[in-house]
């Protein structure tokens, strides 16, 4: 089968790499805007060059194109906890990040917030945080995980999913119990 | 079919409290992120919070950090969200709304919303 080409891939593909067909006379290829350009004005015919302007302050484009205008430049969203890595270039766009110590969780293929790195307080680092990824923790004894954070088994209700973890803990409290009673 | 049915709206004076739910069907519940947006009379859509698969991440709006809490129950696929302190700024229609996974919105789903009316 076949891929289905959009409209504008395959006017482009009869042109060879670097080059796109004019839109109104489809027997000229003209040559493509660098990054960092946009397209003003196709080229007046074979051979001859495109007009190709330099994007405005906000915007940019990062590969080579025929846009009619630039991109506008992404803003970190410091509602987010976002920081610019690198601001926009003309060829770039935003980078954005996180501060040290802490790491992203993707809401959405986009979207994404920075969250602090877990300590492991009660515990011992399993696997350094990372970029995308949080610190997986691995609990001292008489300490269950929740929530990527190590909790004193005296927190342990049985109807949790902690009381195989703290069992023996659970045990000892029943232990006591059951020698008081006698 | 994707069905968000929030309720829990309503009148309450400033300072006042309210619970919003959120009812989710013709979907896997606990493979996605959730959240509730809202709109104010004559203004645009504001995210309010979101909350993880696992309840592990969320997010709050500055504007209402410290007074909403955002929690779901995943065996009854629902979602909630307490509201406490309440101003008269908080009024506006909230909708509930499933986050999309790809793609360059954060929601892809919408509630019919709930009416928050806050006024003494």
């Known amino acids: 089968l076949v891929p289905h080409l959009g409209d504008r891939e395959k006017r482009d593909s009869v042109c060879p790499q670097g080059k796109y067909i004019h839109p109104q006379n489809n027997s000229i290829c003209c040559t493509k805007c660098h990054k960092g350009t946009y397209l003003y004005n196709d080229c007046p015919g074979p051979g001859q060059d495109t007009d190709c302007r330099e994007c405005e302050s906000g915007s940019f484009t990062a590969s080579e194109n025929h846009l009619r205008h630039c991109l506008s430049c992404s803003k970190c969203r410091k509602e987010m906890g976002q920081v610019e890595i690198s601001s926009c270039t003309v060829d770039r766009d935003t980078v954005c990040g996180c501060r040290k110590n802490q790491y992203r969780h993707y809401w959405s293929e986009n979207l994404f917030q920075c969250f602090n790195c877990s300590l492991c307080l009660n515990g011992t680092v399993h696997l350094s945080c990372q970029e995308k990824q949080n610190t997986v923790c691995t609990c001292h004894a008489g300490f269950f995980l929740r929530e990527n954070e190590c909790v004193s088994c005296s927190n342990c209700k049985k109807s949790l999913e902690c009381t195989k973890l703290c069992l023996p803990q659970i045990e000892n409290v029943k232990g006591t119990e059951d020698s008081g009673t006698t | 079919e994707v069905q968000l049915l929030e309720s829990g709206g309503g009148l309450v004076q400033p300072g006042g409290s309210l619970r919003l739910s959120c009812a989710a069907s013709?979907?896997?519940?606990?493979?996605?992120?959730m959240g509730w947006v809202r709109q104010a009379p004559g203004k645009g859509l504001e995210w309010v919070s979101m909350?993880?698969?696992?309840?592990?991440?969320?997010y709050y709006a500055d504007s209402v950090k410290g007074r909403f809490t955002i929690s779901r129950d995943n065996s009854k696929n629902t979602l909630y969200l307490q509201m406490n302190s309440l101003r008269a700024e908080d009024t506006a229609v909230y909708y509930c709304?499933?986050?999309?996974?790809?793609?360059?919105?954060?929601?892809?789903?919408w509630g019919q919303g709930t009416l928050v009316t806050v006024s003494s």
């Open positions: 709304a499933k986050i999309s996974q790809f793609g360059p919105n954060a929601f892809d789903y």
């Open positions: 013709g979907f896997t519940f606990t493979r996605y992120s």
């Open positions: 909350i993880d698969v696992g309840g592990r991440h969320t």
